[in-house]
Structures are given as structure tokens and as C-alpha cells.
């Protein structure tokens, strides 16, 4: 069974700069999975944000512009990489990867 | 049928204003990030302006920045553009367009033309 | 500011291939997608995630990324195809346009 460790504990971003979240694979074929990042903010429920499915194909969350949310999956490292771009306010909360084993 | 409709463009004076329109239907309109594009007479496409669902995240071109303001209302299933100090490059046809899960625009309004002339 | 070229026109006969380049700073890490805008229309989205094809779009309709390059490529081409062809992307929360490509069927 995969398994899944977010090293950062906490990022700390200024406003309008780029932050990037990892997500390590283990015991399981990165490639041979479909990665999923969620964000739950301070007082509301969870919320899907992006994907990327084991055949490469990205998915967002339609409610959020394209370009804001960027996911990668690096096979020799075993990571998948969000990536939030041009900080705001709005970001602020806890992101959380998940895996789904095809 | 998902369907996109552009309305209020027209002639007017530099340093006048308009309010750009667009009304959904066919879809979840409430459940999808949107966009303003443009197209000069005989030139290629423009990006204006982006908005999320629920308008927490706003995005505008430089070109158009402290002039033009994105807005929505969901209620309504409609998508808007204030454009405020216009000058004669805005001269174009707007388009309103869907912003797809899979990462695209796959569905475009018809377009208004805005004219901006003295 | 983010910039993606593309050929100003590509000429091709009827039954030909036709490939229509694109070309931005490392356009191979990010999602471009093609657009096809016939006169007095509004434009049709024909590739998205470099690759892919919306339904409905012909299967003669196909495109490539890598390196600083995207590349729509139509196999067969009809007069039908005759337009106008636009690149995108996105450089972080900016869209992107390329200039557009006027492709004539000879």
C-alpha cells in the first residue's frame, strides 16, 4: 500500500511570490497512481484543488482560474509538487495530498 | 446546450465608460472560473480579466489594470466587465469564455464589439 | 511579460500536413493548448494539455510539446481547416495568447 509525507510542516510566503508544496510517494509507483491536493482553509470545509491522474492528465477545481494551482509528479524522487502561484491572502490554510492507487 | 452570451458593447468617447455583460446557461454557471478576452480589428486574441467562482481570486492584464473590473453574480448566471477611462486601443470584440477543469477555455460567447472614438 | 511566437501564415495543399509552431521560454514545462477561429467566429478550442482533443474535434487534429516549442500538427488537412490558429498558456495567473498563425489551404 502507498504512502504519503508532506515534509513541510509550514511554508511562510510573501505576498505575489510562488510557494511549493511536496508530497513523497512510498511504497508504491508514483507513475502508477493518480495524485490529488485539497486545501482546507480556517473554518471551512475541504476542498479539491487539483489532480494529476496516473496517465498525466491534470484536473483543477473548475471554481479556481487556471494558472493559480500547478501540480507536477516527479518519478525519480517519488514527489508530486504543488505549486500556488502569486500568493494571497486567499491561500492561507492547510494543504493535504492523497493518493489514488489505479 | 452550453451557451455564452455577450451583450452591451457599442460606441463610445474616449474616457467613457461601459459595462459588458455576459449571460450563461447550459451549465453550472456558480462552478466555474471565467474569463474577458479581446480582439482588435485584425489582431490576435488579448486576455483582460480572470475570476474564480466565488470571486475570491481576481486577475487582470496590465493593459487594463485600475480601469476595467471583473464581476459576477451567480444568482443571475451572469458574468460582467466595467470598463472605466477608455481609451481608442480598447477598441475591440469582447468575448466571455468558460474556464474548463481540464485546462482551456472550451466554451466562447459570440462576442460584443465596443468601438471607443471621438 | 511572457511572450509565445508563432509564424505569422502557413500555407499547405489539400491532403498535406500541416504543423503550425509555437515558441515561448520554456513552454515544455507549461500547458499549452490551441485554438482555431474561422472569419466572424468566435474561437474553438482544438488541443488542450498539449495533446489532447475536446470531443468533437477531429481525430486529424493533433499537437506536441517539448523543450521551448509547441507544435499543432493537422494530418490530412481539409479546406475546412482554413483559419486562424492561436497557441496559449499560462505563465503563473496570467493567460497567455500567441500572436496567431493564418493557415491557407492552397
Known amino acids: 500500500a502507498g504512502h504519503l509525507e508532506q515534509p513541510q510542516i509550514s511554508s511562510t510566503k510573501t505576498l505575489s511570490k510562488t510557494a511549493r508544496l511536496e508530497c513523497v510517494v512510498s511504497g508504491i509507483t508514483i507513475s502508477a497512481t493518480s495524485v490529488y491536493w485539497y486545501r482546507e482553509r480556517p473554518g471551512e470545509v475541504i476542498q479539491f484543488l487539483v489532480s494529476i491522474s496516473y496517465d498525466g492528465t491534470v484536473r483543477k477545481e473548475s471554481g479556481i482560474p487556471s494558472g493559480k494551482f500547478e501540480v507536477d509528479r516527479i518519478p525519480e524522487t517519488s514527489t508530486s509538487t504543488l505549486t500556488i502561484h502569486n500568493v494571497e491572502k486567499q491561500d492561507i490554510a492547510t494543504y493535504y495530498c492523497a493518493l489514488w492507487e489505479v | 446546450e452550453v451557451q455564452l452570451v455577450e451583450s452591451g458593447g457599442g460606441l463610445v468617447r474616449p474616457g467613457g465608460s461601459l459595462r459588458l455583460s455576459c449571460e450563461a446557461s447550459g451549465f453550472t454557471f456558480s462552478s466555474y472560473s471565467m474569463i474577458w478576452v479581446r480582439q482588435a480589428p485584425g489582431k490576435g486574441l488579448e486576455w483582460v480579466s480572470s475570476?474564480?467562482?466565488?470571486?475570491?481570486?481576481?486577475y487582470n492584464a496590465d493593459s487594463v489594470k485600475g480601469r476595467f473590473t471583473i464581476s459576477r453574480d451567480n444568482a443571475k448566471n451572469s458574468l460582467y466587465l466595467q470598463m472605466n477611462s477608455l481609451r481608442a486601443e480598447d477598441t475591440a470584440v469582447y468575448y466571455c469564455?468558460?474556464?474548463?477543469?481540464?485546462?482551456?477555455?472550451?466554451?466562447w460567447g459570440q462576442g460584443t464589439t465596443v468601438t471607443v472614438s471621438s | 511579460s511572457y511572450e509565445l511566437m508563432q509564424p505569422p501564415s502557413v500555407s499547405v495543399s489539400p491532403g498535406q500536413t500541416a504543423s503550425i509552431t509555437c515558441s515561448g521560454d520554456?513552454?515544455?514545462?507549461?500547458?499549452a493548448c490551441w485554438y482555431q477561429q474561422k472569419p466572424g467566429q468566435s474561437p474553438v478550442l482544438v488541443i488542450y494539455?498539449?495533446?489532447k482533443r475536446p470531443s468533437g474535434i477531429p481525430e486529424r487534429f493533433s499537437g506536441s510539446n517539448s523543450g521551448k516549442t509547441a507544435t499543432l500538427t493537422i494530418s490530412g488537412t481539409q479546406a475546412m481547416d482554413e483559419a486562424d490558429y492561436y497557441c496559449?498558456?499560462?505563465?503563473?495567473?496570467?493567460?497567455?495568447f500567441g500572436g496567431g498563425t493564418k493557415l491557407t489551404v492552397l
Open positions: 496559449q498558456a499560462w505563465d503563473s495567473t496570467t493567460v497567455v
Open positions: 469564455a468558460r474556464d474548463w477543469e481540464l485546462l482551456g477555455f472550451d466554451c
Open positions: 475570476i474564480s467562482s466565488s470571486s475570491d481570486y481576481i
Open positions: 520554456k513552454l515544455g514545462d507549461k500547458y
Open positions: 494539455q498539449h495533446n
